[in-house]
């Protein structure tokens, strides 16, 4: 059993090394942003025992604008990068807890809160996820639009468009 691709977090990137059960991955806030104190960038592939479906835990990560960069003069256009990330050290303890960011948390109204988009379900043969409080649990709608659709979607109830003879298995394995 493996996890599907994890959900995205605003102003953060993640490079997934392993989709195996119990693997842990870390989001990295994009350049110009930093991890808000008290939030965690970690996500773990866990098993919903009720449904035997693996999913990523929901990270509490919020990437906020780095106050240290607010008053800096913009770099010349030739040196500006748009896909850069700012690694931020965090310890990976067995308990999954990690130290808060070094800078104090403030009520910065300009701070950008993370909008978490649920991860994808790439195991259509699995039954819908139930009995979990994890936001990141995955529900399979078996070819019909999910009840929890992303905002502004306006779709007909037509069947999925899938390449002939190819199905969205992703990194999932059936056991």
């Amino acid at each position: 059993i493996t996890c599907p691709p994890p959900m995205s977090v605003e102003h953060a990137d993640i490079w997934v090394k392993s989709y195996s059960l119990y693997s842990r991955e870390r989001y990295i806030c994009n350049s110009g942003f930093k991890r808000k104190a008290g939030t965690s960038s970690l996500t773990e592939c866990v098993l919903n025992k009720a449904t035997n479906v693996a999913h990523w835990t929901t990270p509490s990560l919020k990437c906020i604008r780095d106050p240290a960069l607010v008053h800096q003069r913009p770099a010349p256009p030739s040196t500006v990068t748009t896909a850069g990330v700012t690694p931020q050290p965090e310890s990976l303890s067995p308990s999954g807890k990690e130290p808060a960011a070094s800078s104090p948390s403030s009520n910065n109204t300009a701070a950008t809160t993370a909008a978490i988009v649920p991860g994808s379900q790439l195991m259509p043969s699995k039954s819908p996820s139930t009995g979990t409080t994890e936001i990141s649990s995955h529900e399979s709608s078996h070819g019909t639009p999910s009840q929890t659709t992303a905002k502004n979607w306006e779709l007909t109830a037509s069947a999925s468009h899938q390449p002939p003879g190819v199905y969205p298995q992703g990194h999932s394995d059936t056991t």
């Epitope: 953060a12 992303a150 779709l155």
Partner: nanobody
Framework: EVQLVESGGGLVQAGDSLRLSCIAS????????MGWFRQAPGNEREFVAS????????VYDDSVKGRFTISRDNAKNTVYLQMNSLKPEDTAAYYC??????????WGQGTQVTVSS
């Protein structure tokens, strides 16, 4: 109904670059998470990258780290996959997918990328 049409594939040499495009159309006001997957002959389809609606959150498979970049232009309803430093093992059919709610549900027909050594 949502239609996804990929383009930009082709035959290139190892080390070259390609940019794939995926144009989304249909009865939609805006698009949520979009992603790219690939499938080599005889292999399962595998995840490559995805991007959220605002374009600020990206997820990549570690195998493409530092080489592939996903981006989107909502004004053009287009998602891009910039592929640099291509390797023979990147040879596959590349599929664009749109996430509805919690799953990637809409799929394009794919575009073939072949990297020769």
């Amino acid at each position: 109904e949502v239609q996804l049409v990929e383009s930009g594939g082709g035959l290139v040499q190892a080390g070259d670059s390609l940019r794939l495009s995926c144009i989304a159309s249909g009865r939609t006001l805006s698009y949520p998470d979009m992603g790219w997957f690939r499938q080599a002959p005889g292999n399962e389809r595998e995840f490559v990258a995805s991007i959220n609606w605002s374009g600020t959150g990206r997820v990549y498979d570690d195998s493409v780290k530092g080489r592939f970049t996903i981006s989107r232009d909502n004004a053009k309803n287009t998602v891009y996959l910039q592929m640099n430093s291509l390797k023979p093992e990147d040879t596959a059919a590349y599929y664009c997918a749109a996430r509805v709610g919690t799953e990637f549900q809409y799929w394009g027909q794919g575009t073939q990328v072949t990297v020769s050594s």
